[in-house]
């Protein structure tokens, strides 16, 4: 960028040419003298450069006309090759008697405001001022390309010049290139290819896989139709015009496929009754994963290999498998699909669920009293080998004992082997309440429904026993 | 195509340290399991250990405390950090893929289901 | 630790013969079946032939094949090529233990 630097004095008030590549303020001579010295403004730095001229000042007007004011004319196309140097002008002869003149660059209809390269020289004689306004560009680009004018305005009037057209001519340049695309097999597809010069016109050749796919170029914009594929393919695109070619991006067009099977899958947390897995997916076969399938099956020999398939969205690679039986050894398998179809099920892997407390309280409890011996027998029978969710340790039996304004509860623990206890009758003449859970390590289950038992005073005997049905027997 | 190229071996005095680089292509660590194997000169295969693809590291017994396995998916690439070695740690040293992998969160275990692609190896030669 | 044993350490054999190579754990394998066989030829790394003991990977000719379960498994190759003189080694995982082994591997040369 140009820094503001003085400018000389020139000796007298008419030289010969001034070039600037800044806007000069020049004050020439009144009628009844001049002022000695040419007063610059120098634009700032990054200021925009125009041709603005102020010629003399008058401090009167002469009534005989004056013939009307236009610019020469001048080469009206200019043609050249990109990155090339360019130079042109505007020329106009002013009589000395305007005032307040000023000429600019425009280029379709806009002002010229960025840091162009305008020059005004400026030949002055006795009657009238010929400036010549040069504008050059050192490279030009294809955004040069237009319709340049030179503007004047003297006292209010505004003079403009014949365009000069310049035309920058280059290699084809792309407005539009082929994209990369995931394809279905042996399903068309449309690649589109445009470009422009000029030079025009465009012409397009298609290349697939470094082969041309059409002897006769086609006009720009070309769109290819490729009737399908059966393999991943490259495709690019030429562009040729009278200063050469030009090669487009080559872009991948994939064939979609079935997904590969998650690469990953862990076993986050485990409880009785369920399993939470996370999974890593495949490669997806250049579509998007729509949801994934968890397959699970007993790992046990014995069991009927049925499998169990909970479906999912794909995200987020997590997922809760339920209403799984406790302390159980389980084969899960998880597989994804996309549109095209259901990846290969994962390796098997191995999980097991953890032991929980028992589903359901044990049954056909019964109790009746022992008077002989002052006990309370309680039988029962353990819950479902499936229900027990775990390995038994044990039961939990509470015996609430109520008379006339006695409650007294009490608990014991009894080993797992054997369904049979003997509690201690507490109370005479009350009733006895009994309840019976299953426990495993994974905790103590549902509590039995209550029996209820009347122990007598002493004396009284009443062995008939009280107890709560099997499920199924009325 | 799908590429492994390891890198950093060479000689090294005893009690020193060394940096093995697996540089991945094709695929990308950020959804796949990678392991170490080393060989020594005339002898059969050694596992080394695994990095999945969340980061989570596990390790031969042998390997614990002295080789670390770490990566950085941004450059796609899977390091072996080797300290305190000994010239019974010459070896080719080889990274590979892990075809499948299971991860026990819960018990801190992971299983390798297969080892599917292999990069070439690099020599390292540990000896005064 | 688990171990996998390789039977024979060396094997020689010609062109065309049938030949057995035997892998035993000290324990069972993950899943029963989650034991690999590798195939190293001098200089190269080794590559993949055979998953969950039975299933050939991508590329594999069909001469290869792997049977067995729990702890003892079999690689066998029908008819022999010169392009399959090589090592193979088997190798598993176990659970509750992340380490991967190796067999010792078996070399199979020419007779």
């Known amino acids: 960028r140009e820094e503001a630097k003085p400018y000389p004095l020139f000796p007298g008030p008419f030289p010969g040419s001034l070039q600037t590549d800044h806007t000069p303020l020049l004050s020439l001579p009144h009628a009844s003298g001049y002022q000695p010295a040419l007063m610059f403004s120098p634009t700032q730095p990054g200021r925009p450069h125009t041709g603005n001229v102020a010629i003399p000042q008058v401090t009167s007007v002469e009534s005989k006309p004056l013939p009307p004011l236009a610019f020469k004319h001048t080469v009206g196309h200019i043609i050249l090759s990109e990155h090339k140097g360019v130079k042109f002008n505007c020329s106009i002869s002013v009589p000395n008697i305007y005032q307040d003149t000023t000429i600019s660059w425009w280029k379709d209809g806009k002002e010229l405001l960025g840091a162009h390269h305008a020059i005004t020289q400026f030949y002055p004689d006795d009657e009238v001022t010929a400036i010549i306004a040069s504008f050059s560009i050192t490279s030009v680009q294809r955004s040069d390309n237009g319709s340049y004018i030179c503007k004047m305005k003297i006292n209010n009037e505004e003079i403009v010049s014949d365009p000069i057209y310049i035309e920058v001519q280059g290699l084809p340049h792309f407005t539009k290139q082929p994209e990369s695309m995931n394809v279905t097999r042996n399903t068309a597809f449309n690649l589109t290819c445009q470009a422009v010069g000029p030079p025009e016109p465009v012409n397009i050749f298609w290349v697939q896989n470094s082969s041309r796919v059409n002897e006769q170029p086609e006009k720009s914009p070309s769109v290819l139709t490729v009737p399908g594929l059966t393999e991943m393919a490259v495709f690019s695109c030429e562009a040729h015009n009278d200063k050469g070619l030009t090669v487009s991006k080559g872009v991948q067009i994939n064939i979609k496929a079935i997904p590969s099977p998650p690469t990953e899958v862990s076993i986050r947390n485990s409880t009785a009754h369920s399993i939470l897995i996370s999974w890593v997916p495949g490669f997806d076969g250049y579509s998007p994963f729509r949801n994934c399938s968890i397959q699970v099956k007993e790992a046990d020999p014995l069991s009927n290999g049925s499998v169990m398939i909970f479906n999912t969205s794909a995200l987020p690679h997590l997922y809760q498998i339920k209403q799984l039986q406790a302390l159980a050894n389980y084969s899960i398998g998880v597989s994804c699909m996309n549109e095209i179809g259901w990846s290969a099920v994962s390796p098997w892997i191995l999980a097991s669920t953890t032991e929980g407390a028992p589903s359901v309280a044990p049954l056909n409890v019964t109790v009746f009293l022992n008077e002989s011996s002052d006990n309370v027998d309680i039988r029962w029978m353990k819950p479902p080998t499936k229900q027990q969710d775990g390995e038994l340790v044990g039961y939990r039996i509470s015996h609430v004992w109520q008379s006339a304004g006695i409650s007294k509860e009490l608990l014991e623990e009894v080993g797992q082997n054997g369904s049979r206890a003997r509690i201690s009758v507490q109370v005479h003449n009350a009733t006895c309440t009994v309840r019976i859970a299953a426990v495993t390590r994974g905790g103590v289950g549902p509590f039995s429904d209550p029996v209820k038992i009347f122990i007598p005073a002493h004396g009284w005997v009443d062995y008939a026993p009280s107890s709560t049905p099997a499920p199924g027997n009325a | 195509e799908q590429q492994l190229v390891e890198s950093g071996g060479g000689l090294i005095q005893p009690g020193g340290s060394l940096r093995l680089s697996c540089a991945v292509s094709?695929?990308?660590?950020?959804?796949?399991?990678m392991s170490w194997v080393r060989q020594a000169p005339g002898k059969g295969l050694e596992w080394i250990g695994i990095i999945s693809s969340s980061g989570s590291t596990y390790s031969a017994s042998w390997a614990k405390g002295r080789f670390t396995i770490s990566k950085d998916n941004s450059k796609n690439t899977m390091y072996l950090q080797m300290n305190s070695l000994r010239a019974e740690d010459t070896a080719v040293y080889f990274c590979?893929?892990?075809?499948?992998?299971?991860?026990?969160?819960?018990?801190?275990?992971?299983?390798?289901?297969?080892?599917?692609?292999w990069g070439q190896g690099t020599l390292v030669t540990v000896s005064s | 630790d688990a171990q996998l044993t390789q039977s024979p350490s060396t094997l020689s054999a010609s062109v065309g013969d049938r030949v057995t190579i035997t892998c035993q754990s000290s324990?069972?394998?993950?899943?029963?079946?989650?034991l690999s066989w590798y195939q190293q030829k001098p200089g190269k790394p080794p590559k993949l032939l055979i998953y969950?003991?039975?299933d050939l990977a991508s590329g594999v000719p069909s001469r290869f094949s792997g049977s067995g379960s729990g702890t003892e498994f079999t690689l066998t190759i029908s008819s022999l090529q010169p392009d399959d003189f090589a090592t193979y080694y088997c190798a598993g995982g176990y659970s509750g233990d992340s380490d991967y082994a190796f067999g010792g591997g078996t070399k199979v040369e020419i007779k």
């Open positions: 324990k069972s394998i993950y899943n029963n079946n989650w």
């Open positions: 969950d003991a039975s």
């Open positions: 094709g695929f990308s660590l950020s959804s796949n399991a």
């Open positions: 590979a893929r892990v075809g499948f992998f299971v991860g026990y969160g819960a018990y801190d275990y992971g299983i390798i289901h297969r080892l599917d692609l």
